[in-house]
């Protein structure tokens, strides 16, 4: 028995070949012997039943001369899954058609971090097929009647080429995924105390109309609990602020990409935030983490102190040095002090490996007065 795979709504071609490689009488039947169509010697396609009953069934007249008498079934339905019989040259050939339906749950437009389940449904009791989907960038996901793709990323967007294999027979279908998300999962901003801070949250997709709402929650390093800094609406790509804290007084751009400005980087603001964006007609939310590291350099009494606040990595080094002098390196990562500093220009550096993340300079005057 020959097996043919077909996807619901598409077409399938069931083969029937003559050994003589020439036109001959043939008949296609259902397994219950009802005639579908055939050719009875005059080169004319004869259909069985009423036209409306069999208008989805056809053959390739151009192939008959070569001894090929395929049965074409268009707009495949699940109930087309059955055995078909081709009668020619006093023999019967059975062809098994397996029609499957593909469902995507929750859909093919998803949010970053969500999962997609691809399910193959069929009426026939077939053994487990192999389903394999390949992204144009090379990523491959495989399964059987159920294929899962978890923790989707923006990079998973675009066209996927999928094949269903059963008994070495293959059927191809495509799916286009659209994974909505931010360009970066996380970002970090380094600022000297008093500097203006800009946070940007570019989206990794473009749509004509984008509607939803969002909020930035902030966990300051020095605070015991997080605080909502700003809430906003997004309508047709226009951003409107709903509520903003009095301290800090954030400003938000009214156009995409989402953009926030903090007038001053102050030690009490150092920490990390989580911007969430809920999009209309989508379950779940988009998230982007943002971190703020603030550097403070001050001379108090007879001690010069450089301190960083906010989420730094253990690989980072904090150094305080005077021009052309040896650096004083922090034993801990976040603070370095020099008692009785010499007069002149001092520089504090926060670095990771050979990369300077930020630096701040302070002029130490002999009178014990300083200026940054």
């Amino acid at each position: 028995k020959t097996l043919v795979l077909g996807k619901e709504g598409e077409s399938a071609e069931l083969p029937c070949e003559s050994s003589q490689k020439k036109i001959t009488v043939f008949t296609w039947k259902f397994s219950d012997q009802r005639k579908i169509l055939g050719q009875h010697g005059k080169g004319v396609l004869i259909r069985g039943g009423s036209p409306s009953q069999f208008d989805r069934f056809d053959s390739k007249k151009g192939a008959w001369e070569k001894g090929s008498f395929p049965l074409i079934i268009n707009k495949l339905k699940m109930e087309d899954s059955q055995t078909y019989i081709c009668e020619l040259e006093n023999r019967k050939e059975e062809v098994e058609l397996w029609v499957f339906k593909v469902t995507f749950s929750p859909g093919t437009s998803l949010l970053q971090g969500q999962s997609l389940t691809l399910t193959l449904d069929s009426n026939s009791k077939v053994s487990n097929p192999l389903t394999e989907c390949k992204h144009k960038k090379g990523k491959v996901v495989s399964g059987s009647k159920v294929l899962s793709m978890s923790n989707l990323r923006v990079q998973d967007s675009d066209f996927w080429n999928c094949t269903v294999t059963l008994d070495q027979k293959k059927n191809w279908f495509g799916m286009t995924l659209s994974v909505l998300g931010f360009q970066k999962a996380s970002s970090i901003v380094y600022k000297k105390e008093g500097e203006q801070v800009e946070f940007s949250f570019p989206l990794a997709f473009t749509v004509e109309k984008l509607t939803g709402s969002g909020e930035l929650w902030w966990q300051a390093e020095r605070a015991s609990s997080s605080k909502s800094w700003i809430t906003f609406d997004l309508k047709n790509k226009e951003v409107s602020v709903k509520r903003v804290t009095q301290d800090p007084k954030l400003q938000m751009g009214k156009k995409l990409p989402l953009h926030l400005t903090l007038p001053q980087a102050l030690p009490q603001y150092a920490g990390s935030g989580n911007l969430t964006l809920a999009l209309e007609a989508k379950t779940g939310k988009l998230h982007q983490e943002v971190n703020l590291v603030v550097m403070k350099v001050a001379q108090l009494n007879n001690t010069l102190t450089c301190e960083v606040m906010g989420p730094t990595s253990p690989k980072m080094r904090l150094t305080l040095k005077q021009e052309n002098q040896e650096a004083r390196v922090s034993e801990e990562q976040k603070v370095v002090q020099v008692v009785a500093p010499e007069t002149g220009l001092w520089q504090c550096l926060l670095s990771e490996g050979d990369k300077v993340k930020m630096d701040s300079r302070i002029q130490v005057l002999s009178r014990g007065v300083n200026q940054t």
């Epitope: 203006q196 047709n236 226009e238 602020v241 938000m252 009214k254 156009k255 953009h259 400005t261 007038p263």
Partner: antibody, heavy 118, light 107 residues
Framework: EVQLLESGGGLVQPGGSLRLSCAAS????????MSWVRQAPGKGLEWVST????????YYADSVKGRFTISRDNSKNTLYLQMNSLRAEDTAVYYC???????????WGKGTTVTVSS | AIQMTQSPSSLSASVGDRVTITCRAS??????LGWCQQKPGKAPKFLIY???TLQSGVPSRFSGSGYGTDFTLTISSLQPEDFATYYC?????????FGQGTKVEIK
Amino acid sequence: EVQLLESGGGLVQPGGSLRLSCAASGFTFSTYAMSWVRQAPGKGLEWVSTISDNIGNTYYADSVKGRFTISRDNSKNTLYLQMNSLRAEDTAVYYCTKDNEDYYMDVWGKGTTVTVSS
Amino acid sequence: AIQMTQSPSSLSASVGDRVTITCRASQGIRNDLGWCQQKPGKAPKFLIYAASTLQSGVPSRFSGSGYGTDFTLTISSLQPEDFATYYCLQDYNYPRTFGQGTKVEIK
């Protein structure tokens, strides 16, 4: 051709009211944000108010908040500015403007003059 | 509100001169800035948006640049019809704010 034509200006006493209209043509009115900008005699430009497209979010300058109301009738392709409790400092030429897709005021009307004086 | 400071407030130049007007925002506004031109007794005309994008129909001698807080409008070769007052406008957020204007006069 995109055109904006303001009307409704005139002389009004302090404390009085006036309603400005702006008839728009040559573009799909409902899909663009619209604004009012004013210019006092011999002074620079001052943004007054904006109404977003068919969603209808409204924004006002602090100097007019609570006294002026911007509105639109998309079926009539018309923008309005209802001005109440008028003050001498509201004396200006009022321009109607259309925003482009990037929310910039790309087309301006010729303006209508409002004079608040006793 | 974001303050926009234009400089100079006025300048005298001759036809053919290269003219530069600057505009500074009191805080970072990305490239959300526009420039418009106004002639006496006329309505303003929009020239540039998104700091550097020329509005359709505006001559290429006009150009804009800048990002964050500092922006520039340049007229590469001043023409007789360019004598006017130029305003910058921040479109980062509400309230939208204009610079005080720069009057370009004939020397």
